[in-house]
């Protein structure tokens, strides 16, 4: 997995008038890292993990950069011509990556009302846009503004590729995120499903990186995909991830089933707990 830094900026307009507030979220290696969500932006680390990466310092630099970015995006939204009445949003997502071979990738994507209309490869400076006429119109609009305003808005649009990578390298220097491996905690629970059946759920939490294999096996053989229900792999707010898998089995056959977990080259199997069936909310409807 490459190391990545992802900026997600959102600004709003109401009845054609651009709102003063904006929302900025920054993800480092796929984890929520920084956030600005008030009229007056104050960069807030998302959890202890982010504080550890940033070290013992104020976040003035991040706050300044994110505030500048927000202002620039508000100006861009103001230049979009087809502002109909009601609420509209302009979103910019900027991502830069450093791969294991030290190669880099950077891109920028614009969304209007949640719909992608313009992308740029920040290394080749190549622009791409969807085929729809609405997207094309928006894209031309925004590209023209960015060209015109390139000098004025250099805080945001000048050397974005370099700036993003510079920040990413700075964060990586902390050592906190560098190729760390945190093994998951695995927990198996059971709940009554229907007459003679129980639902068994296997939860893995607190692991990093996010790639994990979690599945149910019967006597050592994987159950087919369509007999299992998987949860998404989600950040748990501590710089680590969580997920789950569930299946329905016959009561009395619990000892035949194990939850198989594989993460970062390590694996383990986890039996279904025996004893009294706990009545829990089932994942299966």
């Amino acid at each position: 997995e490459p190391h990545s830094l992802r900026y997600n900026l959102t600004v709003l307009s109401w009845d054609g008038s651009v709102q003063s507030g904006f929302l900025t979220e920054v993800h480092l290696d796929g984890q929520p890292f920084l956030r600005c969500d008030r009229q007056k932006c104050r960069a807030k680390p998302q959890g202890q993990w982010a504080e550890d990466v940033l070290g013992n310092k104020t976040w003035d630099r991040e706050t300044r950069d994110l505030t500048g970015n927000g202002k620039d995006l508000r100006m861009t939204l103001a230049h979009i011509k087809d502002q109909k009445e009601g609420l509209h949003s302009l979103q910019e997502i900027r991502v830069c990556e450093i791969h294991e071979d030290n190669s880099t990738r950077s891109s920028q994507h614009f969304y209007y009302d949640g719909e992608l209309f313009l992308s740029q490869n920040l290394e080749t400076k190549e622009w791409t846009m969807p085929q729809s006429s609405r997207a094309q119109t928006l894209a031309m609009n925004v590209r023209n503004f960015l060209k015109e305003d390139a000098m004025k808005t250099k805080t945001h649009y000048h050397a974005m590729h370099a700036d993003c990578l510079q920040e990413l390298r700075r964060y990586l220097k902390s050592g906190v995120v560098l190729r760390r491996t945190v093994p998951p905690m695995v927990n198996v629970t059971r709940s009554e499903a229907s007459e003679g059946n129980i639902t068994v759920t296997c939860r893995a939490s607190g692991f990093y990186p996010w790639n994990i294999t979690l599945s149910w096996r019967q006597d050592g053989v994987s159950l087919s995909h369509d007999t299992q229900q998987w949860g998404d792999v989600l950040p748990d707010g501590n710089g680590t991830y969580q997920t789950w898998v569930a299946t329905r089995i016959c009561q009395g056959e619990e000892q035949r089933f194990t939850c198989y977990m594989e993460h970062s080259g390590n694996h383990s199997t986890h039996p279904v707990p025996s004893g009294k069936v706990l009545v829990l909310q089932s994942h299966w409807q």
Partner: antibody, heavy 122, light 106 residues
Framework: QVQLQESGGGLVQLGGSMKLSCGAS????????MNWVRQAPGKGLEWISY????????YYADSVKGRFTISRDNARNSLYLQMNSLRAEDTALYYC???????????????WGQGTMVTVSS | DIQLTQSPSSLSASVGDRVTITCRAS??????LNWYQQKPGKAPKLLIY???SLQSGVPSRFSGSGSGTDFTLTISSLQPEDFATYYC????????FGGGTKVDIK
Amino acid sequence: QVQLQESGGGLVQLGGSMKLSCGASGFTFSSYSMNWVRQAPGKGLEWISYINSRSNTIYYADSVKGRFTISRDNARNSLYLQMNSLRAEDTALYYCARVSSVTGNTGAFDIWGQGTMVTVSS
Amino acid sequence: DIQLTQSPSSLSASVGDRVTITCRASQSIHNYLNWYQQKPGKAPKLLIYAASSLQSGVPSRFSGSGSGTDFTLTISSLQPEDFATYYCQQSYSILTFGGGTKVDIK
């Protein structure tokens, strides 16, 4: 005692069909996953199909996918293999085999039948 | 699909010899590996499951080891009844057998 007995083998024409059966006795058949494994004359073992106890997980080897169908009838303690579009290379001794239920098992086959011979002729 | 490669494909040994058969998987299968013995005209018999666990009723001269991609079946002191063909089998991803190793009398 615990036993598996295959039947239904014999001579069949190229492109023809045949259905094999495997009768189980001496254990609770409905609790066990089952397999079909074949062995061509003078060759090694080839796993061809798996079905779990509830028939909701079924796997096939690529060599038989789309032509063979595994099924079971827990009330009759029986396992079946429907073979269609038979080819010369399907000529083999066909075994049914039970997946062990021992704790910590890794899909091992602990009980095997004696096999039934299928010969596909042109 | 995962391929299992057994080596050697055949070997000659004498009663009392220590015999080692290897099975290599095309990718890591952790410990999802089993070993079988088959004598001519007979059905296969399970010897070892989970790479190293001895099946009930199997003599202790048989042992299994390995994890990941490389596995070994060892017969510490070959007995007359051990001349047979040995197969490895994995269940990590679907199911497959190795090509077999025939152990005959030197």
